[in-house]
Interface confidence: low
């Protein structure tokens, strides 16, 4: 059976494609393609007769054809227009004419698309942004890439319009991207310059730092306050409710105990109009304010050794206070069975070995004092060395 | 304590409207996504809208899209739902509910005691 | 027809173990996080479990969820009476872009 085949099915535009013939019949008169799924004089492209050899073209021939003595035909700069469908019809000798049909798709080599977005500095959690890819183009794929991956499953994100926009609802100050998208068709393929989202958010709750808040007269009081913020949030600071200084860092020298009080760091973002503010009390004291002796106690202090585990616990009713472990006037925790937890008030030992048995105490402070508990005795026995096997060591 | 309070339900002939609200107390409304879900007579939940904590992503199940329309009032706390051109199918007792994560993982955390509408001539 | 299948009914006696189904596809249960939702006899639907696995505070650890695939199971362990109820799966779908809800499976506690 007489069969076409086009080579590429898929032609880029200003290409070439060739409209290879197959089963042609042996004895023949000659034959003609024409443009379309059937037979139309209007619509000849080409004929060619065997005996004579000659190719005659018809009224649709636009001068970028070629037929060939097996009836194949090449059209060159290929456009558009030329997608369809392409019949040939051959002669034969019989008189019995035969046809067949083939067809080839042009596509535009695509340009390098862009972006445009309705909103390239949208707020946080109140904003959608709107991605656009362009340009439109028929029988184009659209896909689109955050971070250099391919989009993620979230019900934030919502495609439309052929996939050619990308909405991205409620904005989080993590989605800045950056944003490509692609364009593709069968025969070419290109991606955008990357574009990123401006999201303005914040400011968060502001930190102050460092954190103590005991000082000794005389020092020098250095205070930094950050939120974060897009823009940079704006900084302002208040001592007892009363405005200092509009800065970031504040430096007191030379402090004395009128410098105790509140401090306050306000934090501004004039974008999304929010505002934050942190409080740290500052005490400026010559006297150490007195830790409470902290009290120990021990979930058991007589232990079966390589089996038993056990918790010492450092209890004190202070606060803002730091707790730190001894054992043999050595800093804990000296080992890996050696376990800190809630805060450094739990000390947990696990397995317990012999070398542990003996005599431990915990120490609470802060920056200005600091005190330690009764010292707590830990006694390590050991049973009978285990027998493997129910056999007696040999 | 969180509750939401719905109102404005009734019996409407079809092709009349209606405005439901939901009163939300008990939490900062505006930092989450609210939605409605109806459930007809003897049936099971049908979720019908959703509208992020802004307002500004709104999304609806199919069978009201065009017909009805979700709004909320943050200075308020209020939840709205206009039903126009309603059916006979829309007979239901309507919920708000709560999405406690701003639709990361949606789901819906409290719910109003729901206010009937019936369709019916 | 709901886009998430649940079984319509299922029984158990009291201190017994019950497991409910419910199944979907890639476009919801397969990419999204599944909830489920108990509701008693006239009442408004109560939030039993959340991202597949996780239970808001206040309701008993002897409800449990868990996901594969496309499909997601509730287990009620210790069975009482007072779980006789409706019991709903939620995922959203992004084939819908919407939140979408199994047909509801009705527990009976028997005995």
């Known amino acids: 059976q007489l069969t076409t085949e086009s080579m590429p099915f898929n032609v880029a535009e200003g290409k070439e494609v060739l409209l290879l013939v197959h089963n042609l019949p042996q004895q023949l008169f000659g034959y003609s393609w024409y443009k379309g799924e059937r037979v139309d004089g209007n619509r000849q492209i080409v004929g060619y007769a065997i005996g004579t050899q000659q190719a005659t073209p018809g009224p649709a021939n636009s001068g970028r054809e070629t037929i060939y003595p097996n009836a194949s035909l090449l059209i060159q700069n290929v456009t558009q227009n030329d997608t369809g469908f392409y019949t040939l019809q051959v002669i034969k000798s019989d008189l019995v004419n035969e046809e067949a049909t083939g067809q080839f798709h042009v596509y535009p080599e695509l340009p390098k698309p862009s972006i445009s977005s309705n909103n390239s500095n949208p707020v946080e959690d109140k904003d959608a942004v709107a991605f656009t890819c362009e340009p439109e183009t028929q029988d184009t794929t659209y896909l689109w890439w955050i971070n250099n991956q391919s989009l993620p499953v979230s019900p934030r994100l919502q495609l439309s319009n052929g996939n050619r926009t990308l909405t991205l609802l409620s904005v989080t100050r993590n989605d800045t991207g950056p944003y490509e998208c692609e364009i593709q068709n069968p025969v070419s393929a290109n991606r955008s310059d990357p574009v990123t989202l401006n999201v303005t958010y914040g400011p968060d709750t502001p930190t102050i730092s460092p954190s103590d808040t005991y000082y000794r007269p005389g020092a020098n009081l250095s205070l930094s306050c950050y939120a974060a913020s897009n823009p940079p949030a704006q900084y302002s600071w208040l001592i007892n409710g009363t405005f200092q200084q509009s800065t970031q860092e504040l430096f007191i020298p030379n402090i004395t105990v009128n410098n105790s009080g509140s401090y306050t760091c306000h934090a501004n973002n004039s974008v999304t109009g929010c505002n934050r503010t942190t409080v740290k009390t500052i005490i400026v004291t010559e006297l150490s304010p007195v830790v409470a002796k902290p009290q120990i106690k021990a979930s058991k202090t007589t232990v079966t050794g390589d089996k038993d585990s056990v918790n010492l616990t450092c209890s004190t009713n202070d606060t803002g206070i730091s707790i730190r472990w001894f054992f043999k006037n050595q800093s804990l925790p000296s080992s890996e069975r050696m376990k800190l937890s809630q805060g450094n008030t739990t000390l947990s030992i696990n397995p317990v070995k012999r070398e542990d048995a003996g005599t431990y105490w915990c120490e609470v402070f802060n920056p200005i004092s600091k005190n330690q508990s009764d010292p707590i005795m830990l006694n390590v026995n050991y049973n009978a060395l285990p027998q493997e096997n129910g056999l007696s060591p040999g | 304590e969180v509750q939401l309070l719905e109102s404005g339900g009734g019996l409407v002939q079809p092709g009349g409207s209606l405005r439901l609200s939901c009163a939300a107390s008990g939490f900062t409304f505006s930092n989450y996504a609210m939605s409605w879900v109806r459930q007809a007579p003897g049936k099971g939940l049908e979720w019908v809208s959703v509208i992020s904590h802004g307002g500004g992503s709104i999304y609806y199940a199919d069978s009201v899209k065009g017909r009805l329309t979700i709004s909320r009032d943050n200075s308020k706390n209020t939840l709205y739902l206009q039903m126009n051109s309603l059916r006979a199918e829309d007979t239901a007792v309507y919920y708000c509910?709560?999405?406690?994560?701003?639709?990361?993982?949606?789901?819906?955390?409290?719910w109003g005691q729901g206010t009937l509408v019936t369709v019916s001539s | 027809q709901s886009v998430l299948t649940q079984p319509p009914s299922a029984s158990g006696t009291p201190g017994q173990r019950v497991t409910i189904s419910c199944s979907g596809s890639?476009?919801?249960?397969?990419?999204?996080?599944v909830s489920w939702y108990q509701q008693l006899p006239g009442t408004a639907p109560k939030l039993l479990i959340y991202a597949d696995s996780k239970r808001p505070s206040g309701v008993p650890d002897r409800f449990s969820g868990s996901k594969s695939g496309t499909s997601a199971s509730l287990a009620i362990s210790g069975l009482r009476s007072e779980d006789e109820a409706d019991y709903y799966c939620?995922?959203?779908?992004?084939?819908?872009?919407?939140?979408?809800f199994g047909g509801g499976t009705k527990l009976t506690v028997l005995g």
């Open positions: 939620g995922a959203w779908d992004v084939s819908h872009n919407g939140y979408v």
């Open positions: 890639s476009s919801n249960i397969g990419n999204n996080y």
């Open positions: 509910a709560r999405d406690p994560t701003k639709g990361y993982a949606p789901t819906f955390d409290y």
